[in-house]
């Protein structure tokens, strides 16, 4: 803020003049500025024990500008309000009180929580997740062939996060078993019995076993070893309202 | 020295408009801001409004809609204007001036004139 | 608006007594108080203004404090020409409001 702390010129009547400097429009030698030029605002700046008065361009933190037909004034805000818009109006309070409309409050009220980094009071936020993605092919080791029971699995996003108060995150994956038609693996998938795994490169024509991640199994469209006849067809749909769920992941 | 002097009727009939004047001494009324104050009998002070330095006005709200504050430079005065009168505004009315916030408030007063309403 | 309660209403002193009038606002007035004092038939006097500083002229034995809400004039040896009414007055914001008034008596 620019400050004017005006000095007296000429008298008008005993310790007040209008030849005062900079931005003041009646100074004392005593009181320094007593009132303002048009678009300044009065405030008293202390100086040791004794306040001055000073007019300033904008008004200083913890004070807002009141207009009044040729009075211009910073004037306080409330005591537990940091700078606000006007007496009733606070836009960040002084540390240790929470904002919630314009007011300074202890606590937030029910149905609101504190963020302490904002220290604002904010909606309580649920978590929200999406629909559960299909269900991953049916594997035993990472493998799709050469076993009869295996497992398969199924993942959710959470699309919101909780704040502190919110309903917690329900389970974002699910596992269960699964049997699929017991069926030989090809010469590619074929496991690697114990000899094979101590070479360290493939015979020729092999490949090395790959294990599919995550990603792999939620965008895996059905393969041949998973087409079903009509009776496992059945036992799966058993098998999908008996849902033997394991959880692996809680937010 | 600054002096003030209220003038006006001493008596004002209900409904009536009660107009007063203050003729200022020692200084220009533009500058300050010129102030009308009251007191009914036996009671506190109220503070009616003010004319600044400009002719800007500010009245209290509590009487805004009946008050009108004018002023007359080449005479040095300023003037209350207050309508619709009741029993109620039966009081001394003083005019008073100020220079701003960092000096004294109502350093100067008139020696107040008394309203009497009545039929 | 700021209203402004102002105790004792009434007090009975003796000359040379202490005498203390509180002044309570509403909300903060930020130091920007008067007290004034008024005799039977005469317009208030100021005695002091920004809480604490006293008007020329006006004897040492008037002063103000106080801050925030809470502001007190002292009066510390009463003399005879101190009994009258005494008005505190915010001007921190529009409208002006000033005490109902303390009323200092002779004992």
């Known amino acids: 803020q620019n400050a004017s702390r005006g000095r007296r010129q000429r008298r008008m009547h005993p310790n007040v003049s209008q030849g005062c400097q900079g931005g003041c429009a009646t100074c004392s030698d005593y009181n320094g500025c007593l009132s303002c030029k048009p678009r300044l605002f009065f405030a008293l700046e202390r100086i040791g024990m004794k306040q001055i008065g000073v007019c300033l361009s904008s008004c200083p933190s913890g004070y807002y500008g009141t207009r009044y037909p040729d009075i211009n004034k910073c004037t306080k805000c409330k005591a537990d309000c940091d700078t606000c818009f006007n007496k009733n109006f606070c836009t960040k309070c002084k540390s240790g009180f929470y904002l919630h409309l314009g007011k300074c409050l202890d606590n937030c009220p029910e149905g609101l929580e504190a963020n302490n980094h904002t220290m604002e009071c904010v909606s309580i936020v649920h978590c929200e997740v999406s629909e559960w993605n299909p269900w991953s092919p049916c594997t035993k080791k990472g493998k799709t062939c050469g076993f009869k029971r295996g497992t398969e699995t199924r993942v959710r996003e959470i699309i919101q996060h909780p704040s502190a108060k919110g309903n917690l995150c329900p389970p974002t994956n699910e596992t269960r078993k699964c049997t699929v038609q017991r069926k030989k693996c090809q010469k590619g998938e074929r496991g690697k019995k114990g000899r094979e795994r101590k070479r360290k490169k493939p015979n020729k024509g092999e490949s090395k076993e790959a294990i599919p991640d995550s990603k792999s199994l939620e965008s895996s469209k059905e393969i041949p070893e998973q087409r079903e006849n009509k009776q496992q067809q059945k036992k799966r749909k058993v098998q999908d309202k008996q849902k033997s769920v394991s959880v692996s992941t809680v937010h | 020295e600054v002096q003030l002097v209220e003038s006006g009727p001493g008596l004002v009939k209900p409904s009536e408009t009660l107009s007063l004047t203050c003729t200022v001494s020692?200084?220009?009324?533009?500058?300050?801001?010129w102030n009308w104050i009251r007191q009914p009998p036996g009671k506190g002070l109220e503070w009616i409004g003010y004319i600044s330095y400009s002719g800007k006005t500010y009245q209290n709200p509590s009487l805004k809609s009946r008050v009108t504050i004018s002023r007359d430079t080449s005479k040095n005065q300023f003037s209350l204007k207050l309508s619709s009168v009741t029993a109620a505004d039966t009081a001394v009315y003083y005019c008073?001036?100020?220079?701003?916030?960092?000096?004294?408030?109502?350093?100067?007063w008139g020696q107040g004139t008394l309203v009497t309403v009545s039929s | 608006d700021i209203q402004m309660t102002q105790s004792p209403s009434s007090l009975s002193a003796s000359v040379g007594d202490r005498v203390t009038i509180t002044c309570k606002a509403s909300q903060d007035i930020d130091s920007y108080l008067s007290w004034f004092q008024q005799k039977p038939g005469k317009a208030p006097k100021t005695l002091i203004y920004?809480?604490?500083r006293l008007v020329d002229g006006v004897p040492s034995r008037f002063s103000g404090s106080g801050s925030g809400t809470d502001y007190t004039l002292t009066i510390s040896s009463l003399q005879p020409e101190d009994f009258a009414t005494y008005y505190c007055l915010h001007y921190d914001e529009f409208p002006l409001t000033f005490g109902q008034g303390t009323k200092v008596e002779i004992k």
């Open positions: 920004l809480t604490n």
């Open positions: 008073a001036t100020y220079y701003g916030y960092g000096g004294p408030h109502f350093a100067y």
């Open positions: 020692g200084d220009s009324i533009t500058s300050g801001y």
